[in-house]
Interface confidence: low
């Protein structure tokens, strides 16, 4: 029906306005409505002007799209001619009454389809449905992928490219790790990737001044060390150093009136020479205190060494050995006096005997045919040595003795001359002063070590060697090496050390093979006035450990490898050190500070006597331990 109407209208237009000229009223009759008429008539007049004979010929040829008046007039009512829609964006144009409708292609909008729709910003279809990049284009869009991804067949989703699989050698000797859109060349901790060489290179952390004192770089890492022998330990940050602090203060008060007999590990503490009238006889009186069971209290001899007298302790009892031109004697007697109490001892030469008294009670009377020391030129010249004797005497003794004696004497009176002159000598020398109060035990002051030679080989055992150790300890600082076995090549195949724990006011015990901690007993309260007990047993197959709170048979993957290292060292020769380490590199063990505190050690069933050590630092007390410092109301 519409098309019939259009055809009718077209016919009327031809007749009324092309074959003849029409005015506006006549045009109104053709269109039968004002909007179309108002739209048509001005344009009709333009057509007439254009096609009047002879007028604007040049212009018509160049600018007018219509060849004649008919075409020009017929085109006026068609709103879609010339095309008002955007050519790129329209799909069709529909003519209306003095209007037109552009139908847009997908992706375009606007009255004339002149505006591109940005599908990438469509809230109902986020990012155009693309998984990564949405590219808007005129009238359309497309999805694309970031570097390192490829588009899937659905043209929307992206898939990661696994560069590590595509090019296995992409990272060289480093490990290739695929990551979304890329890859990384990974190195172990402590290594850095070198792009040029395509390999992992060790980071030298020591060149970056990571450590406060000593730094040892190794492939993949570094370790900081502090000089334990100077009283430093590694701080919790594992980089800086801090002072090894006292956790249990001890009463280290000394008195110069008390002479310490163990000032020297080897050697005499005091040497005196007497020149007295020939009627003088030997006499010595003193108070004596010790927990030691054997050692020399004093040795006296004539000026020509022909006669001598030894006052010593053996098995805790007084022993006298004497030798002169008339006789050679050895006598032991009296009660045990190594009880830590002050005992009054007197040795007096009488006319026919030597009398030994303890607490003024005679315990021995030794007969002698003549004077002990022979006077010469009207004088009795005598040399007296405290806590030792000249080296050559050792071979002359009637019965050998270990001269070392950890004890104290006070109130001495030699040759009836009182203490004159001696006190003045002692007063000046702090290390000759004795502690006011001591307890049973051995004391390591944190400044030195003792060395023993112990044969750990057990022929009867299938293991070949074993180390069974019992430690009774009362540490005064929370860090230090208690026991170490040291090889000839300056390595430490086994050590037992103390370190301050990360948890407050407690300590850990470390067992180490060389510089590796093979076991750590954590958070023990060892800094107390009570002794703590620790046992461990080690052979080439096992490591067992016992504390009052924990029993462990230690087993982890690495242990057998570490025990193999220890086994190798034990088959060679090891020296046993108590209280610290000899001069080995800082890096030889996890701890290198000296142990400070009391400690008694039993190895393979034998209680170690520090007097029997091959060497011992003078400050280590073999048989006495300072008491715990008690706060008094005044202090």
């Amino acid at each position: 029906a519409n098309s019939l109407l259009e055809e009718t209208k077209q016919g009327n237009l031809e007749r009324e306005c092309i074959e003849e000229l029409c005015n506006k009223e006549e045009a109104r009759e053709v269109f039968e409505n004002d909007p179309e008429t108002d739209y048509f008539y001005p344009k009709y007049l333009v057509c007439l002007r254009s096609f009047q004979t002879g007028l604007f010929t040049a212009a018509r040829q160049s600018t007018n799209a219509y060849p004649d008046l008919r075409s020009c007039v017929n085109a006026i009512p068609d709103q879609c001619s010339p095309l008002p829609c955007n050519e790129d964006g329209y799909m069709s144009c529909k003519d209306g009454k003095a209007s037109f409708t552009c139908t847009c292609k997908p992706g375009w909008q606007g009255e004339k389809c002149e505006f591109d729709i940005n599908e990438c910003k469509d809230p109902s279809n986020i990012n155009g449905g693309c998984s990564q990049i949405c590219d808007n284009t005129p009238g359309s869009y497309h999805c694309s992928c970031k570097n390192g991804f490829v588009m899937l067949s659905n043209k929307k989703d992206c898939k990661d490219v696994d560069e590590c699989s595509l090019k296995p050698s992409i990272c060289g000797t480093a490990v290739c790790k695929n990551i979304p859109g890329d890859f990384e060349c990974e190195c172990p901790e402590g290594y850095r990737y070198n792009l040029k060489s395509k390999s992992c290179e060790d980071i030298d952390e020591c060149s970056e001044n990571m450590c406060a004192q000593l730094c040892v770089n190794y492939p993949g890492g570094y370790t900081c060390y502090c000089d334990g022998k100077k009283g430093f330990k590694l701080a919790q940050d594992q980089k800086s150093c801090e002072v090894v602090s006292v956790c249990l203060p001890l009463n280290l008060d000394t008195k110069y009136e008390l002479l310490y007999l163990a000032e020297q590990f080897a050697g005499v503490v005091l040497y005196l020479k007497f020149r007295l009238p020939e009627i003088s006889r030997f006499s010595a009186e003193f108070d004596f205190r010790t927990y030691d069971s054997e050692g020399v209290i004093l040795y006296a001899e004539s000026i020509d060494h022909s006669a001598w007298l030894l006052i010593a302790l053996r098995g805790g009892k007084i022993e006298v050995q004497l030798k002169n031109e008339h006789t050679s004697k050895i006598t032991t007697g009296g009660d045990v006096i190594n009880n830590g109490l002050w005992n009054m001892v007197s040795v007096e030469e009488l006319e026919h005997s030597i009398s030994i008294k303890i607490a003024k009670e005679a315990v021995m009377d030794i007969n002698k045919p003549g004077p002990l020391f022979k006077p010469e030129n009207g004088l009795l010249e005598t040399k007296v040595y405290f806590a030792g004797f000249p080296r050559k005497v050792e071979s002359e003794l009637i019965k050998p003795i270990n001269p070392r004696l950890d004890g104290c004497i006070r109130s001495w009176n030699l040759m009836k001359q009182g203490a004159s002159g001696i006190k003045e000598i002692i007063q000046e020398k702090q290390n000759k002063h004795c502690l006011v109060t001591v307890e049973k035990g051995s004391y390591y002051p944190g400044s030195g070590i003792a060395q023993f030679h112990i044969d750990y080989n057990n022929v009867s055992s299938a293991e070949g060697w074993h180390v069974n150790v019992t430690l009774n300890i009362r540490p005064s600082t929370g860090t230090g090496v208690m026991l170490a076995l040291v090889s000839g090549n300056n390595t430490v195949p086994f050590a037992v050390s103390l370190v301050d724990s990360t948890s407050e006011k407690s300590q850990d015990i470390l067992l180490s093979v060389e510089n590796t901690v093979i076991y750590r007993i954590q958070a023990l309260s060892l800094c107390s006035d009570q002794q703590s007990h620790l046992e461990f047993r080690v052979n080439r197959n096992n490591l067992e450990l016992s504390t009052p709170l924990k029993i462990e048979t230690i087993s982890h993957e690495d242990l057998q490898r570490q025990l193999a290292v220890l086994d190798k060292a034990m088959k060679a020769k090891v020296a046993t050190y108590l209280g610290g380490l000899p001069d080995v590199p800082f890096s030889a063990t996890p701890v290198n500070a000296f142990y400070n505190g009391c400690m008694e050690v039993n190895i393979n069933g034998v209680q170690l006597d520090l007097d029997e050590a091959i060497s011992k630092h003078n400050d280590i007390r073999a048989h006495s331990c300072p008491s715990v410092w008690k706060k008094t109301k005044n202090s």
């Epitope: 009774n472 007990h533 046992e535 067992e544 924990k550 029993i551 462990e552 087993s555 039993n602």
Partner: antibody, heavy 122, light 108 residues
Framework: QVQLQQSGPGLVKPSQTLSLTCAIS??????????WNWIRQSPSRGLEWLGG?????????DYAVSVKSRIIINPVTSKNQFSLQLNSVTPEDTAVYYC????????????WGQGTLVTVSS | EIVLTQSPGTLSLSPGERATLSCRAS???????LAWYQQKPGQAPRLLIS???GRATGIPDRFSGSGSGTDFTLTISRLEPEDFTVYYC?????????FGQGTKLEIK
């Protein structure tokens, strides 16, 4: 063959002290490789280790935190025994009390006493 | 302290069957420091297994133990009538030494 024989009263008044003794035969209380323990059992608490004593060149004690402030375990070397003293008892302490040997260094219990039912009641 | 949890609380089986008892620790008990005990009414506990898997002297080989760290199992391969009683696990790796609450094995 190790045997442990327990003795002691079966009834104790609240706030008083519970005392039990364990006599050892076939082993020594001073054995360097053993620990001598007390364990109790009650329906509410089940089996509960109380503590032990052991000799390693000197005597040591080891107590459970729950009773530490009021327990004493002592060796009696002259009689080859060890004893338990639990002070300030309450009805909560009513249980069967066992003495037991901890083998070697380890605190698993290979020999047990016959058990003593101790009732805390006024 | 280390808490030991035994499961199941009660296990009902017939003679000749296989029993599997479980013991779980709240933290690692070290190198297999776990023991199993059997307790019959009116008697003291009797040691069956120590070190998680080592049978005590005189214990029949139908009893076996396994596990390490935090998970342990006692297995009785063929139940005999005398096996129907209560079983306890105990850790001795660290003080205080603790026991499980027990598993009762009863005849179905």
């Amino acid at each position: 063959q190790v045997q442990l024989q327990q003795s002691g009263p079966g009834l104790v008044k609240p706030s008083q002290t519970l005392s039990l003794t364990c006599a050892i035969s076939g082993d020594s209380v001073s054995n360097n490789n053993a620990a001598w323990n007390w364990i109790r059992q009650s329906p509410s608490r089940g089996l509960e280790w109380l503590g032990g004593t052991y000799y390693r060149s000197k005597w040591y004690n080891d107590y459970a935190v729950s009773v530490k402030s009021r327990i004493i375990i002592n060796p009696v070397t002259s009689k080859n025994q060890f004893s338990l003293q639990l002070n300030s008892v309450t009805p909560e302490d009513t249980a069967v009390y066992y003495c037991a040997r901890g083998s070697s260094w380890y605190r698993f219990f290979d020999y047990w006493g016959q058990g003593t039912l101790v009732t805390v009641s006024s | 302290e280390i808490v030991l949890t035994q499961s199941p609380g009660t296990l009902s089986l017939s003679p000749g069957e296989r029993a599997t008892l479980s013991c779980r620790a709240s933290q690692s008990v070290g190198s297999s420091y776990l023991a199993w005990y059997q307790q019959k009414p009116g008697q003291a506990p009797r040691l069956l297994i120590s070190g998680a898997s080592g049978r005590a002297t005189g214990i029949p080989d139908r009893f076996s133990g396994s596990g390490s760290g935090t998970d342990f199992t006692l297995t009785i391969s063929r139940l005999e009538p005398e096996d129907f009683t209560v079983y306890y696990c105990q850790q001795y790796g660290s003080s205080p030494y603790t026991f499980g609450q027990g598993t009762k094995l009863e005849i179905k």
